[in-house]
Interface confidence: low
């Protein structure tokens, strides 16, 4: 069998909301993957599991099942959303993310994704991880790949 290539493209959008009373930030982060099937037979994308880390803490997880199949020598672009919560010991970020004196409230997040594909009863897992910058101060739609190159204020470690 030839390879199945998984390419993490980047953050597509990030939608933010706040809980004033709990000093909590909710970020719904939609990511884009390109999955290429270099084989002459179809493969099934069985599931995608993803997690997001902030300052070495997991702040969100997601799992998509029975996603799609990819035809021979074909490529599919798949979007998946990870709901994340920045709270509790990280509530200091609430002030940073809601400060109107700052134009862009970028934070650095570690995106981890594992794609499980199957073909002819054989299962294969491909994992990727990437640091991405996300604006936690407003709803943002990114051009694909754009969120890799933003300036960012590093969070407290």
């Amino acid at each position: 069998p030839r390879s199945i290539d998984v390419k993490y493209i980047g953050v597509k959008s990030a939608y933010v909301s706040y809980d004033v009373q709990k000093r909590t930030i909710y970020l719904n982060i939609t990511n884009t993957l390109n999955i290429t099937n270099n084989n002459y037979y179809s493969v099934e994308v069985e599931n995608i599991t993803a997690q997001v880390q902030f300052a070495k803490t997991v702040i969100g997880k997601a799992r998509l099942n029975n996603i799609t199949h990819i035809g021979p020598l074909d490529m599919k672009q798949i979007d998946y959303t990870v709901p994340t919560v920045i709270a509790e010991e990280m509530s200091y970020m609430y002030d940073f993310c809601t400060l109107i004196s700052i134009k862009v409230h970028n934070i650095v997040l570690m995106m981890q994704v594992t794609v499980t594909t199957t073909y002819f009863g054989h299962s294969e897992q491909i994992s990727q991880e990437r640091y991405q910058y996300v604006d936690c101060g407003r709803n943002t739609t990114y051009q694909l790949g754009q969120s890799e190159y933003l300036n960012v204020l590093q969070p407290q470690q």
Epitope: Y18, Q21, K22
Partner: antibody, heavy 118, light 112 residues
Framework: QVQLQQPGAELVKPGASVKLSCKAS????????MHWVKQRPGQGLEWIGN????????HYNQEFKDKATLTVDRSSNTAYMQLSSLTSEDSAVYYC???????????WGQGTAVTVSS | DIVMTQAAPSVPVTPGESVSISCRSS???????????LYWFLQRPGQSPQLLIY???NLASGVPDRFSGSGSGTVFTLRISRVETEDVGIYYC?????????FGSGTKLEIK
């Protein structure tokens, strides 16, 4: 549609306690805070406190800290407020009202009139 | 605690005219996120309060656009254009920037 159902009236004796209920329907109970507000006859509104039904986190107005206890029963989608050591000063209409994170008090109960009398 | 002051206990108005109801807070209700946490409610006689305006200037769902809210960090105005008889009742402002949430004493709208 969203509804917050409260009993119309409660008659209680001085020194006793009363537990007021507020039954929520028409929305996901655990995703909205529940607030309690007091209104004495012919007077204005006073915020007593609130509770997050998802984890029972509470905040109280200090003036009511020793008077009111807020709880929820997630199995019946009901919020409760217990008032203790009642005096004539506690005779009032008590409202429950829900709030999301941003848009507070968009739905109110009809209120329970508590009368403290021997 | 933040003190909310509604200086006018009542305001008389003729149906069809406009009226403004004012409210003042003892400290700014402008949050660092840009929102101003000032709410307006109407309590009609014998009824529960009804939300009119949230975050100082946003019209609540189902409220006629005759109602509008404006203000700065500490001084706020509820304006009702083309007053109708059904608008009678007591208007309360409320802050929920910080605990405990506090209400103004209310302003009664009376029809002349």
């Amino acid at each position: 549609q969203v509804q917050l159902q409260q009993p119309g009236a409660e008659l209680v004796k001085p020194g006793a306690s009363v537990k007021l209920s507020c039954k929520a329907s028409g929305y996901t109970f655990t995703t909205f805070w529940m607030h309690w507000v007091k209104q004495r006859p012919g007077q204005g509104l006073e915020w007593i406190g609130n509770i997050d039904p998802s984890d029972s986190e509470t905040h109280y107005n200090q003036e009511f800290k020793d008077k009111a206890t807020l709880t929820v029963d997630r199995s019946s989608n009901t919020a409760y407020m217990q008032l203790s050591s009642l005096t004539s000063e506690d005779s009032a209409v008590y409202y429950c009202a829900r709030s999301s994170n941003w848009d507070n008090f968009d739905y109110w109960g009809q209120g329970t009139a508590v009368t403290v009398s021997s | 605690d933040i003190v909310m002051t509604q200086a006018a206990p009542s305001v008389p108005v003729t149906p069809g005219e406009s009226v403004s109801i004012s409210c003042r807070s003892s400290q700014s209700l402008l949050h660092v996120n840009g929102h101003t946490y000032l709410y307006w409610f109407l309590q009609r006689p014998g009824q529960s309060p009804q939300l009119l305006i949230y975050r100082m200037s946003n019209l609540a769902s189902g409220v006629p656009d005759r109602f509008s809210g404006s203000g700065s960090g500490t001084v706020f105005t509820l304006r009702i254009s083309r007053v109708e008889t059904e608008d009678v009742g007591i208007y309360y402002c409320m802050q929920h920037l910080q605990y405990p949430f506090t209400f103004g004493s209310g302003t009664k709208l009376e029809i002349k």
